[in-house]
Interface confidence: medium
């Protein structure tokens, strides 16, 4: 028991007229000692679930349930995950800009279309906001040093292989 509210630790409250440090009641917290009241803990319900439970010194933290994502500071609201052809920004789901795509649901980003010409290939099928460009086969003329593009497993990016 302290004789001054200034000496109270987080997790307690203290009234000036009766300067005794008292523990915060259940479901309340105080991150700074010496305050006249403890704060009510946040409850994560509905589209929210607990990320961190409340303690006597820290408020609870919420996150969104599966299929939803947080918006606003301290996850003040939940919004449904974005569709293919969109990306999540601070303002919510936005359509991919021209020249980019996202082929997945969720909170991923729109990625730039593959640049077929960097690999010496032509565009076989133009890209959309949901699908990447499809590149044609490489133009292979076996000169002394020829570069063949090899598409890596599962994705449209390109590795280069030197054939000497």
């Amino acid at each position: 028991v302290q004789n001054s509210c200034d000496n109270c630790q987080p997790g307690t409250f203290c009234r000036k007229y009766n300067p005794v440090c008292k523990s915060c009641p259940p479901s309340t917290f105080s991150s700074i000692g010496g305050q006249p009241n403890c704060n009510i803990c946040r409850v994560c319900a509905g589209y929210f679930r607990f990320k961190k439970f409340c303690s006597s010194t820290h408020n609870a933290e919420c996150e969104c349930i599966e299929g939803f994502h947080c918006l606003g500071p301290q996850c003040t609201r939940c919004e449904k995950d974005c569709r293919p052809g969109q990306e999540l920004t601070k303002q919510g789901c936005k359509t991919c800009s021209l020249g980019t795509f996202n082929d997945q649901n969720g909170t991923g980003v729109c990625r730039p279309w593959t640049n077929c010409s960097l690999d010496g290939r032509s565009v076989l099928k133009t890209g959309t906001t949901e699908k990447d460009v499809v590149c044609g086969p490489p133009v292979v003329s076996f000169s002394p040093s020829t570069t063949i593009s090899v598409t890596p497993e599962g994705g449209p990016g390109g590795h280069s292989l030197q054939v000497l």
Partner: antibody, heavy 120, light 110 residues
């Protein structure tokens, strides 16, 4: 614990190619995330160079597009940087790092960095 | 292309509060999340704040992040500054399919 470690020559001649490897332990690079290269120039300017995604997709900084190639060896859990036609302006500390294209989109694990000097 | 601008250096005294700024040009702070990294020379950078104001586990609550729409800026505030806070602090954002970094602020603790 996830760890990344860069390796490669500390000195490269102008007009040659710079080649670096990043070895990842504690996480499989084909599971998730985008595996990035970042460099820090003398004077502290930091530049994102590009990444190879877990599915093999690559993306790079438009300022480097014509010179950069990022590849990987999934059997060794490594990814690589090749930067062609280097000049003294490419002298920097090179870092590999893990980035998520999903929220939250930040670099959560970094290698210690490797200093590369371009000089004749 | 968007640019993140930070002051080159900031000095502060032990035990005080310091606020580091990161201003976005050719972009909107309300559209893009900002992240902050602490970097000691010769070591790996570590994340101090992500998504404007989120603190990763293990980062002291002396560190906090905020944004101000009117100045189009993000801020990293360090309360009760300690000697070990002396480092370079970088801000970072993902804008138009590109990761961009600020020039870094060297924080000196007097």
């Amino acid at each position: 614990e996830i760890q990344l470690q860069e390796s490669g020559p500390g000195l490269v001649r102008p007009s040659q190619s710079l080649s670096l490897a990043c070895s990842v332990t504690g996480y499989t690079i084909t599971s998730a995330y985008d595996w990035s290269w970042i460099r820090k120039f003398p004077g502290n300017k930091m530049e994102w160079m590009g990444y190879i995604a877990y599915i093999g997709f690559t993306n790079s900084n438009p300022s480097l597009k014509s010179r950069i190639s990022i590849t990987r060896d999934t059997s060794k859990n490594q990814f690589f940087l090749q930067l062609k036609s280097v000049t003294t302006e490419d002298t920097a500390t090179y870092y590999c790092a893990r980035w998520s294209s999903y929220i939250p989109r930040y670099f959560d694990f970094w290698g210690p960095g490797t200093m590369v000097t371009v000089s004749s | 292309q968007a640019v993140l601008t930070q002051p080159n250096s900031v000095s502060t005294s032990l035990g005080s509060t310091v606020k580091l700024s990161c201003t976005i040009t050719s972009g909107n702070i309300e559209d893009n999340f900002v992240h902050w990294y602490q970097h000691y020379e010769g070591r790996s950078p570590t994340t101090m704040i992500h998504n404007d104001d989120k603190r990763p586990d293990g980062v002291p609550d002396r560190f906090s992040g905020s944004i101000d729409s009117s100045s189009n800026s993000a801020f990293l505030t360090i309360n009760n500054v300690e000697i070990e806070d002396e480092a370079i602090y970088f801000c970072h954002s993902y804008v138009s399919s590109i990761n961009i970094f600020g020039g870094g602020t060297k924080l000196t603790v007097l």
